[in-house]
Interface confidence: low
């Protein structure tokens, strides 16, 4: 169980000529509202196919009236999040459809008129519990900026919200801040509560209270770009004033990057991150325009077509850099559950799962009990992909179909006699012993050395094993 959340940041005319000035028709004022629709999988589904994962409608936004001389603004939006609850597992791969609707408030016969203004569709992979993903999409002449995430609710955890954590009254074996999970009681799940102030953009945590930095960032809260940190270089003598190692001469000294490029060290060399409009080893080549297709990974290029005009790349979630060319090593976030091996193939993230686990992030423990019944009151035990029945007393075999003699294993200690019984076995203990298996010696004073006999049972009485 969980909820998908969508936050619309802005909706307005896209850049460039021919952008509309107003969402309203000439008939008068209007207001906007949004509809979100979620469909499972990444396939291109027909627009009219049902929103199988759910749908939600926003409130109406404030009334907008076009002001002829004013520049076209970002339009007034409805407040709050759009939330789509999901009851079952989060699928990980889904299609997100966002529709912008216009409600005309002029003198309409029969009340307000609705019309679809823009529709964007994104096919995405998204793990539940991850950070907000930001996106910018064009729909015709309109531009929509939004963020979204999926999060688990109630006691669900995991990237698919499929594992249930149950609160315990007993002290946790897992240490402070960790909670035991069912059904794998030995596996502990840390709620993702990072150190206070840890950068949402450049930091992450695997244990409560920590703040680990993504590549290129440093500092206790991952707010310092690595290239500016005085403690980053590990060459040279230690500085008594800073407590850091003072960097010695390095490949970036004297900044080999031209045209305002920033230099970062690579093993034995350097790399220039170039500003818009420049590229090359040292940012020495200029004259790039949108016509050159400089925005990678689905980035949206905005800018003029003439050689002197710079451009801006609006990057999709997960990419950064002047040209959306850089992506954080997504495997550093350890997205593969249950010991799965993470492979970042650049164009996709893949988890190679251990035996007994499946799913995009190895989040599903393959339940070999599905469709398998254990006979005669036995219960199916799931574990690592293997099907095993825990049989009721008196039965055995793979599916508990074979009758078993409960006395065959000689369960009664110290010479006690075993009797098969409809609900199990009974031990008749030899003098001087007691217990369900005759395991406790009785002292001469008639008091057992271990737990006292339950009321109504004297030492030596046959005891039924429940």
């Amino acid at each position: 169980a969980g909820v998908f959340e969508l936050q619309i940041h802005s909706f307005g005319p896209g850049p460039g000529p021919g952008a509309p000035r107003s969402p309203c028709s000439a008939r008068g004022p209007c207001r906007l509202f949004f509809r979100v629709c979620l469909k499972p999988g990444l396939s291109e589904e027909a627009a009219e196919s049902p929103c199988a994962l759910g749908a939600a409608l926003s409130a109406r936004g404030p009334v907008y009236t076009e002001q002829p001389e004013a520049p076209a603004p970002d339009l007034p939006l409805p407040n709050g999040l759009l939330q789509v609850p999901f009851r079952d597992a989060w699928p990980g791969t889904f299609s997100l459809i966002i529709e912008t609707w216009r409600e005309e408030l002029g003198d309409q016969i029969g009340g307000p008129a609705w019309s679809l203004l823009a529709r964007v569709t994104r096919r995405r992979r998204l793990a539940a519990g991850g950070p907000w993903a930001r996106d910018i999409q064009r729909a015709g002449a309109w531009e929509l900026r939004f963020s979204y995430r999926a999060r688990c609710e109630l006691l669900a955890v995991g990237t698919a919200c499929t594992r249930l954590c149950r609160p315990r009254s007993a002290p946790s074996r897992c240490g402070p801040g960790l909670r035991p999970c069912a059904p794998l009681e030995d596996e502990c799940e840390a709620p993702p509560v990072c150190r206070a102030g840890c950068s949402l953009e450049h930091g992450f945590c695997e244990q409560p209270g920590e703040c680990r930095c993504l590549e290129g960032w440093t500092g206790p809260l991952c707010t310092v770009p690595a290239s500016t940190s005085s403690c980053l270089g590990l060459r040279g003598p230690s500085s008594a004033t800073t407590g850091c190692l003072v960097p010695g001469p390095g490949p970036c000294d004297g900044n080999p990057c031209a045209n305002g490029g920033s230099c970062s060290e690579t093993p034995g060399s350097f790399e220039c991150t170039c500003p818009r409009g420049f590229y090359g080893l040292r940012c020495e080549v200029s004259g790039v325009t949108c016509a050159d297709g400089p925005c990678f990974n689905g980035g949206l290029c905005v800018g003029g077509a003439d050689p002197d005009s710079a451009y801006i790349c609006h990057c999709p979630p997960g990419f950064q850099g002047s040209n959306c060319e850089k992506r954080v090593d997504r495997c550093s976030l350890q997205p593969c559950r249950n010991g799965g091996l993470c492979l970042d193939l650049g164009h996709a993230l893949r988890c190679r799962c251990r035996a007994g686990f499946a799913g995009p992030r190895c989040e599903h423990n393959l339940d070999d009990c599905a469709g398998r019944a254990c006979a005669n009151g036995g219960t199916c035990v799931e574990g690592g992909g293997a099907h095993r029945c825990s049989c009721a007393l008196g039965f055995g075999g793979r599916d508990c179909r074979e009758r078993a003699d409960p006395c065959a294993a000689r369960p009664c200690a110290h010479g006690g006699r075993c009797y098969a019984h409809f609900s199990g076995l009974v031990c008749a203990c030899a003098p001087g012993y007691m217990g369900s298996r005759c395991e406790f010696p009785v002292h001469p004073d008639g008091v057992s050395a271990l737990p006292a006999a339950p009321p109504g049972l004297r030492p030596g009485d046959p005891q039924r094993y429940l």
């Epitope: 093993p267 170039c274 590229y279 400089p294 990678f296 060319e325 650049g346």
Partner: nanobody
């Protein structure tokens, strides 16, 4: 530091085919997609020329006019390997073939320019006899 190692060259009759490979090491697999890569060749006594390139990020490909429809460049992200499939070889394809890489992106229209590439392999010889 990125190291590039080419293989797959050899002697072949005109009209034959070859597949050249270039393995990139010393660069994290997770960021291999950020390398723009290309194949260049140099025949004895001639200038080095770019024959095919594939840019980072989008994987846009570019080819020299002399090899269009005969050469195909591709990149195997899982194995950090660049390939050049050569069909219908001609004697004028005889040259030393070099693999080159640059960190980040290179505009496709300029991706066959040698001085934009930082990392170079040692080369593999292709000889085509008529």
């Amino acid at each position: 530091q990125v190291q590039l190692a080419e293989s797959g060259g050899g002697s072949v009759q005109a009209g034959g085919s070859l597949r050249l490979s270039c393995v990139a090491s010393g660069y994290p697999s997770s960021t291999y997609y950020m390398l723009s890569m290309a194949w260049f060749r140099q025949a004895p006594g001639k200038e080095r020329e770019g024959v095919a390139a594939i840019t980072s990020g989008t994987g846009s490909t570019s080819y020299a006019d002399s090899v269009k429809d005969r050469f195909t460049i591709s990149k195997d992200y899982a194995n950090n390997t660049l390939y050049l499939h050569i069909n219908n070889l001609k004697p004028e394809d005889t040259a030393m073939y070099y693999c080159a890489a640059a960190s980040g992106w290179i505009v496709p229209s300029r991706s066959l320019t040698a001085n934009l590439y930082r990392y170079w392999g040692q080369g593999t010889q292709v000889t085509v006899s008529s």
